[in-house]
Each structure stands twice: as structure tokens, then as C-alpha cells.
């Protein structure tokens, strides 16, 4: 509360996250023409990626391009992109929405239509949705724990989220445990009354609010985090503003002499510890 | 502007970015001692990387050292590096500028000059400049859309930059379209009075500033950003500071059983969005 | 100092860093049954990786566990997890300590300990204690260079904390060259009150602060930074709330058409740049 | 020591059985994964089959997954190879060796992660 004799002081907040999980993974898996149930287990090392304190990623979807090679071929059919004739390619342009540049010829994509040629990454990447349910929806289940240092210089004082008569065991919950910093993610999204399962598909972004409301003062003094939780990512996005969140990433590889890639679509929940409040002293 | 009878509080703000855009690169490959030119195609899982919501980069340019082995080997003959006899080499020491560790050897590294032999990734990387115009120079033509949610906790209040009624084929014009989030990466440089082209052959750090000023009161609610854009690293920058902005990293990959690896020097742009402003009500 | 006629803005900050340093790592190379020493050079692109503006990372000792592909294998045995029957392994779950699923069987480990069956990347992490002393212990002689720009946008005014006049060859001392923006990782550690060595075998957060106070009125005009130096992370913390830094990240790799990975847990020393301050004008 | 013998090898008919034993001593050879190779003639040896120390998980070549079977007696220091459903392209000689390592989960089919072949025993399939 605003206590106006205090002098107020914004806090200086530093972010330490460690994700904790396996997923197990079956998907249709084709080699030799043959298609099969595959089985694959994720861990962290598989799932997410050694990013920035204030931010954390959780893989929770992908689809896979495999064994790209730089050469031409024909771009993928989506609405709008099918030709009939070389008149509607044009030579050296770059569609935003496709993955080359185009040579000018019309060429056969499959037996019935026939796509512009461009030069790319071949083949071009199958803008197919994303699997559903998503194929790392077991993730739900991962617990992230969560360590935060803050400091007030201008009152020279320091402190953290997590006290020494903590238990490594426990996990939050608004009423039972609400100092416990360790999190699972599933109880992160029914907290903030949005459905894993669903975002999973998709991906999108969740903010972990921690606010420090400190009073310094000798006689009152109290500086514990509150933790609440928000969607950031807006679930009635427009497509042609990308909803969900993913991005692409590539594994390069040589074979016989010719570098190709895996090119891995990625969807998942980036977690966005947000940091905020004062500390004031009289 | 400020209004004296309002409570003011600082911006709790998230940042997504998606860049869109290909590249079409030509440079000289040497394979088995014939140079040709190579053309290839990049896209953003090529020239740009996972990073955090505040910042993304995109790769502009870059210089290669291909099959890099640990091994025994000259060092690069930058000025001051040459050596006549082996008095001039120091087992054991480092030179910063150097990539490896002196073996105390005086070696020939080519018909003309002698340098100290070092235990590195041979054969060392050469300190040639940054290709000249940038490699991606075309990445002047690529897009960037931003979405930006903020929050005044104290206010309750939640918005974003992005809303319902707006069109996702729309580009940033600071007059014709200035609420517009899809932003073309030479007009920001336009706009901050810069030369991509130029630029682009060092690298360098690019500000996009957000700034929200928003009166939350119901009777004269205003609350939309403002976008302005500044270059951040120091074009006039002394040599020995490092100018423009650059990273090295490495492909690592096994060949007849010897662990090898290509070291990619990056030049690019890093783009910080720095967002700010506050939220103020009666 | 405070003064109260003025109006007071908080910074607005970017940061750039490039670090520098080689490291010759000893340590312990099994081949074909054979164990002898081997010798390995680390540059930047093998112990940092291209991350955001406010924080990098500094890798100081490393685990692998080399060729983990996906089959079943016997778990590690780490404290309570040997079994003695079948009884003791249940089908599908998930242990968060462990790194697979179990099958349910109880299977030999090595001759003395049996320990659950798990769906893993095999064979699984042996829990072993980071190598003591740190393998790239010598990090403590790298230097890293910070260049910050910071900027006031209601005063309309902008600085940096390297000045033309600066020399790129200094390094920063709190008595003899306090403005020197380039920093030994060990002199950061020394004026932390923190000892390097001990640090750099389980990894940490080190927090590099830099305080602007800054007056910028034209009579009495100052706007220098101020640096200063803390831990971050906890070291007197608990064995459950996972103390030091470290992360674990795979490469993965294909042999005889067999998806293989090898899996590197990287301790190091996380470096958090903390930009705070204000400018006051009349 | 270790001395890897080979034992079992001769001519059978296409369709036909034969089971290859390998003794070893020297030295116990029950910490180790252990494995069949074979070689043609005018052809490089090639991995066949392979079993880890403990007798739990066992690894084949696509072409006798199914028809082949590896096995162990640590009790006895003894490997096996039960071979049914043979067919002329398994005519070669068959070596056992010993697993050296590291990490037999990856390397369970590369030749040089072995060591001490034995002198090897001929299996010859006529159709």
C-alpha cells in the first residue's frame, strides 16, 4: 500500500529458470516409402533451448522438413500459388510467403497442379498445420523452477525468492504454497484460465508476474514475491498476424558431399518473467 | 503531457517479433582448388536465430573457415605477428588477438613469411575484412512484424499494440501508416538516418523505442504507442572498440572419425526494442 | 545526489559485450578401451554462445555423455533408484530425477546393482560430479568488453560509457581506471568478494552493475557510469533447488542412418548486466 | 590374455540351421558386450549381431533380424549365434569378438569399438 513519507525505489531484478520433464512422443514416421508409429522420448536438452534469464521456451509441437537440398524445384501449392502457364512466374521474385525466389517457369508440382519453380531449400517446406493434439502435450506436466534475486541499490538491499527453510519438493499453489517457486506448467495456464492442451497446438506466450511490494522499514519490514499469471499472446489474432508462437530453426548436415538441413518448425509457450515493483523506506 | 493530479506507473511490457524475408547470396566457392561462384538461398531459419522477445538479429553478412581440426599450425600473419626465429615465439602464451596457444616454434607460413606455431583450430582463421557490399545485403528488403502486450498492474490495465480492425499486409510509414506493426528493415534504417547498405557490411545495433504515454482515465482515454527508431552501437567507434556488430560460432561435425568444425564469423544487425512510457489515472 | 527541483527519468538502456580469451582444456579421452590424456583448444565459439544484449555466458566445465541414441537401457543408479524385482518399476512413469520412461522390468545395471528399465536416450547420464578443478578454469584470465548506450527520450538526450578519448588496450580497475569498459572475468569475481576457481566448477550468476546518475542540467552537467559488481546466484543453497548454473544442450548427429546425440551439460558463469539510474534536468 | 575360439561353422543347405558357439578365456569376459561378425570372400568384415554384458538387449543387421538369434552363458563364458532360415548370402567367415567400448548403446556395429577376433569358423550355404 502507498505509504507517501516513504522514499520508493524500482527494483533491480535478476531471473535463473530450470525446466524439468520427459515427454514421450509417437508420430507417423515413413522411411523407405514404409510408414510407421515411431517412439521417441524429449528431454530438456531436446525440448527447450538455452535462452535468457527473463524468458524460457517449452517446445510443445513441431513439424519436420527433412534432408533439404539448395537446388530448384516447385514451391508448395497453397492458395493462390498454382500456375498454368510460365506468364504467371516471375523470374527473380520473392513472394513473402513462400521459401525461394522464382526462376519464371510454371512446372508440375504433383499429377494435378503445377506450382512456379522457385530456388530454395527443395523441397520447399508443406505449410501443413501443426499436429493435433500436439505431439509434446505431455508437457503439461514439466515444472519449471524459478529463482529470482532482486535489489534496491538506493537502499542497498538484497533479497530472493527463495528463502533457506524452502522445500525442494514442494510445488506452488495460490492457496496452499504460494511461496513455492517451483511451478508446473499446466497449474501456470489453469491459473490464468487458459487450456494447455489447446495453446499446445499452436504455441503462444504466458507471462509469470512477480511483484515485489517491499517496505524496508525496520519496524514493518516485509518483501516477499506475489506470483500471478496472464496470457500475453492474443488468442484472437488475426492469421495474417501469425498467431500462436513458433519459429524455424535448422540442423545442417553434410551427406556425400552435399550440405543439407533439417528444417524444424517449432511450436511451444515462451514463458515471460515479469518483474516489477518497489521497495520503499521512510 | 503531464498531468500533476494523476498516479503514474511504469510500463510492464513483452515483445514478439517474426522476420520475414529471403536472400538470395552469390560468393566465391573454392572446391578442390577450382573457384566458382555459388549462388544460394537464405531464409530465416539461415539468417536468423531463437532469440529473446527484446531483441532479434539478422544476419547481413559473413566470412567462413571451413574444416577447422585441433591441431599444430601457423597463426594468421596480422601486422605485428611475424616472426624470424623461434626467440620471437613464447611457449604457452596467448596473445589476445590470436586464436591459439604458442607452441615457442618460429614455422613458414607461406613462401614469404614465418609466424609462430600454435595449438588452435587449424588452419586459423584468417582476419580478412567483411565482404564488401554485404553478402545479405538484400535484407534491407525484409520485414518485421512486432507484437507488444503491456501492462499497468497498478491500473489493471492491458493492451497491445495490435488491434482487431488492422490489416496484416500493411507496412510502417511514420505519416501514412504510423500504427502499423510490420516494419521493413531499410525503412527503419530510413527513418533513424542511416545507410543499410553501409551498415551492413560491419554490423550494427539498431533501436526501435516504444513509447506508450497513456491517460487511463475514462473520460480522456488515450493509449497507443509511438514508434521511433535510433541507431544504438557507434558508428565512429575506435578500432580497438570493436566497431559494428558481430558473433562467431561453429558447426561442429565429425569426418573419418576426426572431430571438425566451420567457424562462421556473423556480421548483422541486432535489433533492441526498447519499450517505455507510463500509465497514468486520476 | 538527490534534487528535488528536478524531473527525474529512468534509463533507457541497450548493451553490447565480446568476450575474449582461449583456454587449453586437459582431461581424460577413452578410445577404444584405451584412456590417455588429450589436449583441446577452447576459442569463443566453443564456450559462449551468440546470446541477448544484458546477459552472456561464460562456459567453465563441462560433462558429456557422447553416441546417446533412443532405445531401452538400465537408468542410473543414483541414490534410491535400485530395484531388486520388477515390483519396483512401474510401467509409463516418469521419475523427475530420472531421464526415460520405465517399462516396468528391473534389469541389470553393472554386476552388483540392478536399477529400473527406462525408454531413454541411451546409455543414460551418469550422474558424476562436475570435474574439479574446472576444465576451462583458465577462463579466469578472459576479458570481456561492454558497451552500453543509454538514453533519456524525455530529456531528448543520449551517451555511452566508451568516450573517443578511451583506450581499447585498458582494463578496468576501481582506483586506477574506473572508466575502462573492458573487464577481466577475474578481477570481477575479485572485487565481487568471490573466488573464481571455486565458482567456475558448478557455475553461477554474476551480476556487473552499471549506475547512471546523471545531471543534466548545462551549469553542473555529470552523466558517467558507475560500476559495480555482485553474486547472484545462491551459494549457500540447497542441494533441491539445483545451486550454481549449468544447462544441458545435445548435438545431434545420424551414423550408419541411426539418429545419435551427444549430450553436454555446460557449467559456467552467467553474466547479468543490470543498467539502472536516472537523469534529472531542471 | 583373451583367447576367443569358434566353433560350430560348416555346410548346410538353404532353409537349414546351425548354431555357433565361441568360448572365451583368458580373462571373463561377462563386463563386456560381446558380437558376431562375418566376412565374404573379396568383401570387408561386417557386423552380424551383438549383445550387451548383461544378455538384456541384443542388436542384429537388418538382413538376419528375425532369423538370427544372439545369445550368452556368462556362467560359461560362452557366446552363441542360433542361425535358422539360412540363405546363400550368409555364406562367410564367422568371427565372435568382444566389446571394448565406450558406449555399447551406439557403437554396438562398428568394427573398431571390438577387439580379439578369434581365428573365425566358415559357414557355407548352398542352395
Known amino acids: 500500500s502507498d505509504k507517501l513519507y516513504q522514499r520508493k525505489e524500482p527494483v533491480i531484478s535478476s531471473v535463473h529458470t530450470k525446466v524439468k520433464g520427459i515427454a514421450e512422443v509417437t508420430e507417423n514416421v515413413t522411411e523407405g516409402g514404409v510408414t510407421k508409429l515411431g517412439h521417441s522420448i524429449f528431454d530438456t536438452a531436446d525440448y527447450t533451448f538455452p535462452l535468457q534469464g527473463n524468458s524460457f521456451f517449452v517446445m510443445t509441437n513441431y513439424v519436420k522438413s527433412e534432408g533439404q537440398v539448395q537446388t530448384l524445384c516447385p514451391e508448395y501449392p497453397r492458395r493462390g500459388a498454382q500456375c498454368s502457364s510460365d506468364r504467371r512466374c516471375k523470374k527473380g521474385w520473392m513472394d513473402p510467403q513462400s521459401k525461394g525466389i522464382q526462376t519464371g517457369r510454371c512446372v508440375p508440382y504433383d499429377k494435378t497442379r503445377k506450382t512456379c519453380e522457385v530456388s530454395a531449400w527443395c523441397p520447399t517446406e508443406e505449410e501443413k498445420e501443426a499436429p493435433r493434439p500436439a505431439l509434446l502435450r505431455s508437457a503439461e506436466n514439466f515444472t519449471v523452477l524459478i529463482k529470482n534475486n532482486i535489489h534496491f541499490p538506493g537502499h542497498n538491499y538484497t533479497t530472493r525468492n527463495i528463502l533457506p527453510t524452502m522445500n525442494g519438493s514442494c510445488t506452488f499453489h495460490k492457496t496452499w504454497d504460494p511461496q513455492c517457486s517451483i511451478f508446473r506448467l499446466g497449474d501456470i495456464f489453469q491459473e490464468a484460465g487458459e487450456n494447455f492442451t489447446e495453446v499446445a497446438v499452436q504455441g503462444g506466450i504466458m507471462g509469470i508476474e512477480i511483484y515485489w511490494d517491499c517496505n524496508l522499514d525496520s519496524w514493518s519490514h516485509h518483501c516477499r514475491p506475489r506470483y500471478s499469471f496472464r496470457r500475453l499472446d492474443d488468442k484472437n489474432m488475426d492469421e495474417s498476424f501469425v498467431p500462436g508462437y513458433n519459429f524455424r530453426y535448422a540442423k545442417y548436415y553434410k551427406e556425400n558431399n552435399v550440405e543439407k538441413r533439417t528444417l524444424i518448425k517449432a511450436f511451444g509457450i515462451r514463458f515471460d518473467i515479469l518483474v516489477f515493483g518497489t521497495g520503499g523506506k521512510f | 503531457s503531464d498531468k500533476l493530479y494523476q498516479r503514474k506507473e511504469p510500463v510492464i511490457s513483452s515483445v514478439h517479433t517474426k522476420v520475414k524475408g529471403i536472400a538470395e547470396v552469390t560468393e566465391n566457392v573454392t572446391e578442390g582448388g577450382v573457384t566458382k561462384l555459388g549462388h544460394s538461398i537464405f531464409d530465416t531459419a539461415d539468417y536468423t536465430f531463437p532469440l529473446q522477445g527484446n531483441s532479434f538479429f539478422v544476419m547481413t553478412n559473413y566470412v567462413k573457415s571451413e574444416g577447422q581440426v585441433q591441431t599444430l599450425c601457423p597463426e594468421y600473419p596480422r601486422r605485428g605477428a611475424q616472426c624470424s626465429s623461434d626467440r620471437r615465439c613464447k611457449k604457452g602464451w596467448m596473445d589476445p588477438q590470436s586464436k591459439g596457444i604458442q607452441t615457442g616454434r618460429c614455422v613458414p607460413y607461406d613462401k614469404t613469411r614465418k609466424t609462430c606455431e600454435v595449438s588452435a583450430w587449424c588452419p586459423t582463421e584468417e582476419e580478412k575484412e567483411a565482404p564488401r557490399p554485404a553478402l545479405l545485403r538484400s535484407a534491407e528488403n525484409f520485414t518485421v512484424l512486432i507484437k507488444n502486450n503491456i501492462h499497468f498492474p497498478g491500473h489493471n490495465y492491458t493492451t497491445r499494440n495490435i488491434l482487431p480492425t488492422m490489416n496484416g499486409s500493411c507496412t510502417f510509414h511514420k505519416t501514412w501508416d504510423p500504427q502499423c506493426s510490420i516494419f521493413r528493415l531499410g525503412d527503419i534504417f530510413q527513418e533513424a538516418g542511416e545507410n543499410f547498405t553501409e551498415v551492413a557490411v560491419q554490423g550494427g545495433i539498431m533501436g526501435i523505442e516504444i513509447y506508450w504515454d497513456c491517460n487511463l482515465d475514462s473520460w480522456s482515454h488515450h493509449c497507443r504507442p509511438r514508434y521511433s527508431f535510433r541507431r544504438l552501437d557507434d558508428k565512429n567507434m575506435d578500432e580497438s572498440f570493436v566497431p559494428g556488430y558481430n558473433f562467431r560460432y561453429a558447426k561442429y561435425y565429425k569426418e573419418n572419425n576426426v572431430e571438425k568444425r566451420t567457424l562462421i564469423k556473423a556480421f548483422g544487425i541486432r535489433f533492441d526494442i526498447l519499450v517505455f512510457g507510463t500509465g497514468g489515472k486520476f | 545526489s538527490d534534487k528535488l527541483y528536478q524531473r527525474k527519468e529512468p534509463v533507457i538502456s541497450s548493451v553490447h559485450t565480446k568476450v575474449k580469451g582461449i583456454a587449453e582444456v586437459t582431461e581424460n579421452v577413452t578410445e577404444g578401451g584405451v584412456t590417455k590424456l588429450g589436449h583441446s583448444i577452447f576459442d569463443t565459439a566453443d564456450y559462449t554462445f551468440p546470446l541477448q544484449g544484458n546477459s552472456f555466458f561464460v562456459m567453465t566445465n563441462y560433462v558429456k555423455s557422447e553416441g546417446q541414441v533412443q532405445t531401452l537401457c538400465p537408468e542410473y543408479p543414483r541414490r534410491g533408484a535400485q530395484c531388486s524385482s520388477d515390483r519396483r518399476c512401474k510401467k509409463g512413469w516418469m521419475d523427475p530425477q530420472s531421464k526415460g520412461i520405465q517399462t516396468g522390468r528391473c534389469v541389470p545395471y553393472d554386476k552388483t546393482r540392478k536399477t529400473c528399465e527406462v525408454s531413454a536416450w541411451c546409455p543414460t547420464e551418469e550422474e558424476k560430479e562436475a570435474p574439479r578443478p574446472a576444465l576451462l578454469r583458465s577462463a579466469e584470465n578472459f576479458t570481456v568488453l561492454i558497451k552500453n548506450n543509454i538514453h533519456f527520450p524525455g530529456h531528448n538526450y543520449t551517451t555511452r560509457n566508451i568516450l573517443p578519448t578511451m583506450n581499447g588496450s585498458c582494463t578496468f580497475h576501481k582506483t586506477w581506471d574506473p572508466q575502462c569498459s573492458i573487464f577481466r572475468l577475474g578481477d570481477i569475481f575479485q572485487e565481487a568478494g568471490e573466488n573464481f576457481t571455486e565458482v567456475a566448477v558448478q557455475g553461477g550468476i554474476m551480476g556487473i552493475e552499471i549506475y547512471w546518475d546523471c545531471n543534466l542540467d548545462s551549469w553542473s552537467h555529470h552523466c558517467r557510469p558507475r560500476y559495480s559488481f555482485r553474486r547472484l546466484d545462491d551459494k549457500n543453497m540447497d542441494e533441491s533447488f539445483v545451486p550454481g548454473y549449468n544447462f544441458r544442450y545435445a548435438k545431434y548427429y545420424k551414423e550408419n542412418n541411426v539418429e545419435k546425440r551427444t549430450l553436454i551439460k555446460a557449467f559456467g558463469i552467467r553474466f547479468d548486466i543490470l543498467v539502472f539510474g536516472t537523469g534529472g534536468k531542471f | 590374455e583373451v583367447q576367443l575360439v569358434e566353433s560350430g561353422g560348416g555346410l548346410v543347405q538353404a532353409g537349414g540351421s546351425l548354431r555357433l558357439s565361441c568360448a572365451a578365456s583368458?580373462?571373463?569376459?561377462?563386463?563386456?558386450?560381446m558380437g558376431w561378425f562375418r566376412q565374404a570372400p573379396g568383401k570387408l568384415r561386417e557386423f552380424v549381431a551383438s549383445?550387451?554384458?548383461?544378455?538384456?538387449?541384443?542388436r542384429y543387421i537388418d538382413s538376419v533380424e528375425g532369423r538370427f538369434t544372439i545369445s550368452r552363458d556368462n556362467t560359461k563364458n560362452t557366446l552363441y549365434l542360433q542361425m535358422n532360415n539360412l540363405k546363400a548370402e550368409d555364406t562367410a567367415v564367422y568371427y565372435c569378438?568382444?566389446?571394448?567400448?565406450?558406449?555399447?548403446?551406439?557403437?554396438?556395429?562398428?568394427?573398431?569399438?571390438?577387439?580379439?577376433y578369434g581365428q573365425g569358423t566358415q559357414v557355407t550355404v548352398s542352395s
Open positions: 569378438a568382444y566389446f571394448l567400448g565406450p558406449n555399447w548403446y551406439s557403437n554396438y556395429g562398428r568394427p573398431s569399438s571390438y577387439d580379439f
Open positions: 583368458g580373462r571373463t569376459v561377462s563386463d563386456y558386450g
Open positions: 549383445i550387451n554384458w548383461s544378455g538384456i538387449y541384443t
